[in-house]
């Protein structure tokens, strides 16, 4: 049988083992409505997901354990994450404090890796926006997304600047996943 | 030859079928000119888009027709669009009904799948923003993506809240697309 | 041994080379302050970028000079960005001209693709959007990402309205990446 | 600024094939697709097809299809155009021009370069 | 395939008069139509592309106008230059196709 990869490339190169690509590690996690729970007081709260219910899956070998997705094998991965706020504003922007413009509210995404050999968190990704709607009921999404080395090990999480202002309501909305380039 | 995907590989595996990525379905559908049509009452209108001049191409199987991509094989997606909005707003953030503010206009995206056996499509991803601009020409982009299991014989379109306020003068604003991982 | 490349898929198919995913040329970089530089007139100042310190990699042959990286290898790429911009508008919102409102200020990325046989870019992705916010410090990101074929010697940049309004302070703010399929 | 140069002409005899290049220069090469377009002596214009220098797609008029084959080379700028089993009233000028697409959902562009034409005789 | 008619075959005019060429489309094409100029020996030249718009370089005394079967190309003072075959061409569906061209000679 003619094997594609005997082939010699244009360039040299030695290939790693060759792996079928269905058999990488992938998660695509949904929202669903946030318990309240303790966090971190310098840290965003993190937020928890459905891993396997509508949309939602993981699959060989990428687990989804208490708001962590685990990576199960070093390599690189692209990482996103979408998370719908809502809310509202009371004309945030016109208090001023000493003549000057108020620092307005903001809502923030922040994509965390967690190494246990390693005591701090690491932000890869982060979003962040001013809020400052003249008396509304606003909502809007924050979209992150973009490739990472991980290695074996790794946690990844999703913290939320404040959780009583994600939109649970559906999973097309507020959602996570990595999956194995 | 040395063959690498004759390598044990750290953790034990099945192999699926080896596969060259240069032959997996892709697309990158840009903006054109929408023309009105018709959609059910309950629906947001969805998007007809350029599938071959410019930055758009279809290629391996998958195809457009009809504002559906159509999907060749079974597997995971990478799924994502951006639409550019633009609009004229006049002060609807300061307009209070009963004492309450109003609910605020609003733009969404939302990508959805259609499957010939179920009658009902699937929302896959949904990107949803409030316009509350006092007085102003005001233009701004939902981007969304993320990952999905998909099935041969899947369609997928975008739909828009109002296809007026779409912007269709540049193909690098407003566009579509998938690729088999 | 059992080699999976060898069984038969579902649809008749020529393999190209089969090659290990790991040796795909990749980057991902983060901000860094910006220099002041000069630009040409009628186009938006390009970014720089850190391309191997913290988060930021280059690997496969994929490298980064002088705001550019270079495509290696041509092939369909995912191409992504996010530029977080802070500044400080003062209520243009309602500024009226005539009677009518103004033209907002605004602010736009652009990742543009540059091919050494021609001098004009292409610009491949576009984030454009208003900005109005009433006598407030903002801050917001705006992300882009896609897919497109590229050629080997094509140059990617990522080019801003404004650089002065460009969040450099942390590298999971700001970032630009690319890789092959 | 943007050229397209054609090869030669040729006389070729009935049922042989031609295989007529197109070298581009000044312009992004895989952003603009190529059409050709053939005019028969004393005739009007006939659009043959289309090829994308991006992926390599193609369209075919469907008086050629079958007979005629449209490809790209990216690394040399070039397209060309072959026909097959050559007639008598194939003989033609036979341009390549470039598919202006101005990357605007709005517009649809023309043929805005053209080659000089390449002048193909089938005599037996 | 989308057959294109044009109207006249011929127009004989004189330099300095206004010039109206006709082409209709066997279905509507939208405003996806162009217009060329070829004159003897030479390539064709791109005038108007998307029913209305001028192509780089074109002169101002050449419009179209029209929109989903009718279009129409205005010379609006013929220059001795001007003198040529004019041909519409659709591209709002595949196949592309020309109309048989309309020769404006000189009077």
């Known amino acids: 049988a003619l094997k594609g990869q005997e082939f010699a490339p244009s360039h040299q190169q030695v290939y790693a083992p060759l792996r079928a690509d269905g058999d990488k590690p992938r998660a695509h996690l949904t929202v669903v409505r946030q318990t309240p729970t303790q966090h971190f007081k310098n840290q965003f709260p993190a937020l928890h997901w459905e891993h396997e219910l509508g949309l939602a899956f993981t699959k060989n070998r990428m687990n989804y354990t208490n708001k962590f997705l685990l990576i199960p094998e070093s390599g690189d991965y692209f990482i996103y994450s979408q998370v719908t706020f809502r809310g509202m504003t009371s004309e945030c922007s016109e208090i001023r404090q000493a003549g000057r413009p108020n620092k307005p509210d903001s809502i923030t995404v922040v994509i965390t890796k967690v190494t246990d050999s390693y005591p701090e968190p690491t932000q890869l990704l982060m979003g962040t926006k001013s809020v400052c709607e003249v008396g509304s009921n606003w909502f809007q999404p924050i979209y992150l997304g973009a490739m990472f080395s991980l290695q074996e090990g790794d946690k990844l999480m999703v913290n939320v600047s404040d959780i009583s202002l994600v939109d649970y309501t559906k999973e097309d909305k507020t959602f996570f996943g990595a999956f194995l380039l | 030859a040395l063959k690498g995907q004759e390598f044990a590989p750290s953790h034990q595996q099945v192999y699926a079928p080896l596969r060259a990525d240069g032959d997996k379905p892709r697309a990158h559908l840009t903006v054109v000119r929408q023309t009105p049509t018709q959609h059910f009452k309950n629906q947001f209108p969805a998007l007809h888009w350029e599938h071959e001049l410019g930055l758009a191409f279809t290629k391996n199987r998958m195809n457009y027709t009809n504002k559906f991509l159509l999907i060749p094989e079974s597997g995971d997606y990478f799924i994502y669009s951006q639409v550019t909005f633009r609009g004229m707003t006049s002060e609807c953030s300061e307009i209070r009904q009963a004492g309450r503010p109003n609910k605020p206009d609003s733009i969404t995206v939302v990508i959805t799948k259609v499957t010939d056996s179920y009658p009902e499509p699937t929302q896959l991803l949904m990107g949803t923003k409030s316009v509350c601009e006092v007085g102003s020409n005001w233009f701004q982009p939902i981007y969304l993506g993320a990952m999905f299991s998909l099935q041969e014989g899947d369609k997928l379109m975008v739909n828009v809240s109002d296809i007026s306020l779409v912007d269709y003068t540049k193909e690098d604003k407003t566009f579509f697309g998938a690729f088999l991982l | 041994a059992l080699k999976g490349q060898e069984f038969a898929p579902s649809h008749q198919q020529v393999y190209a080379p089969l090659r290990a995913d790991g040796d795909k040329p990749r980057a991902h970089l983060t901000v860094v302050r910006q220099t002041p530089t000069q630009h040409f007139k009628n186009q938006f100042p390009a970014l720089h970028w850190e391309h191997e310190l913290g988060l930021a990699f280059t690997k496969n042959r994929m490298n980064y000079t002088n705001k550019f990286l270079l495509i290696p290898e041509s092939g369909d790429y995912f191409i992504y960005s996010q530029v977080t911009f802070r500044g400080m508008t003062s209520e243009c919102s309602e500024i009226r001209q005539a009677g009518r409102p103004n033209k907002p200020d605004s602010i736009t990325v652009v990742i543009t693709k540059v091919t050494d046989s021609y001098p004009e870019p292409t610009q491949l992705l576009m984030g454009t959007k208003s900005v109005c916010e009433v006598g407030s410090n903002w801050f917001q990101p705006i992300y882009l990402g896609a897919m497109f074929s590229l050629q080997e010697g094509d140059k990617l940049m990522v080019n801003v309205s404004d650089i002065s309004l460009v969040d450099y302070t942390k590298e999971d703010k700001t970032f630009f990446g690319a890789f092959l399929l | 600024q943007v050229q397209l140069v054609q090869s030669g002409a040729e006389v070729k005899k009935p049922g042989a094939s031609v295989k007529v290049s197109c070298k581009a220069s000044?312009?992004?090469?895989?952003?603009?697709?190529i059409s050709w377009v053939r005019q028969a002596p004393g005739q009007g214009l006939e659009w043959m097809g289309w090829?994308?220098?991006?992926?390599?797609?193609?369209h075919y008029a469907r008086m050629h299809q079958g007979r005629v084959t449209m490809t790209t080379d990216t690394s040399t700028r070039t397209a060309y155009m072959e026909l097959r089993s050559l007639r008598s009233d194939d003989t033609a000028v036979y341009y390549c021009?470039?598919?202006?697409?101005?990357?605007?959902?709005?517009?649809?562009?023309?043929?805005?370069?053209w080659g000089q034409g390449t002048t193909v005789t089938v005599s037996s | 395939e989308i057959v294109l008619t044009q109207s006249p075959a011929t127009l004989s005019l004189s330099p300095g008069e206004r010039a109206t060429l006709s082409c209709r489309a066997s279905?509507?094409?939208?405003?996806?139509l162009a217009w060329y100029q070829q004159k003897p020996g030479q390539a064709p030249r791109l005038l108007i592309y998307?029913?209305?718009n001028r192509a780089t370089g074109i002169p101002a005394r050449f419009s179209g106008s029209g929109s989903g079967t009718d279009f129409t190309l205005t010379i609006s003072s013929l220059e001795p230059e001007d003198f040529a075959v004019y041909y519409c061409?659709?591209?709002?569906?595949?196949?592309?196709?020309f109309g048989q061209g309309t020769k404006v000679e000189i009077k």
């Open positions: 021009a470039r598919e202006n697409y101005y990357g605007s959902g709005a517009y649809r562009g023309g043929m805005d370069a």
């Open positions: 090829i994308s220098t991006y992926n390599g797609k193609t």
């Open positions: 000044g312009y992004d090469f895989t952003y603009y697709g």
């Open positions: 279905q509507s094409v939208s405003s996806y």
């Open positions: 061409q659709q591209r709002s569906n595949w196949p592309w196709t």
């Open positions: 998307d029913a209305s």
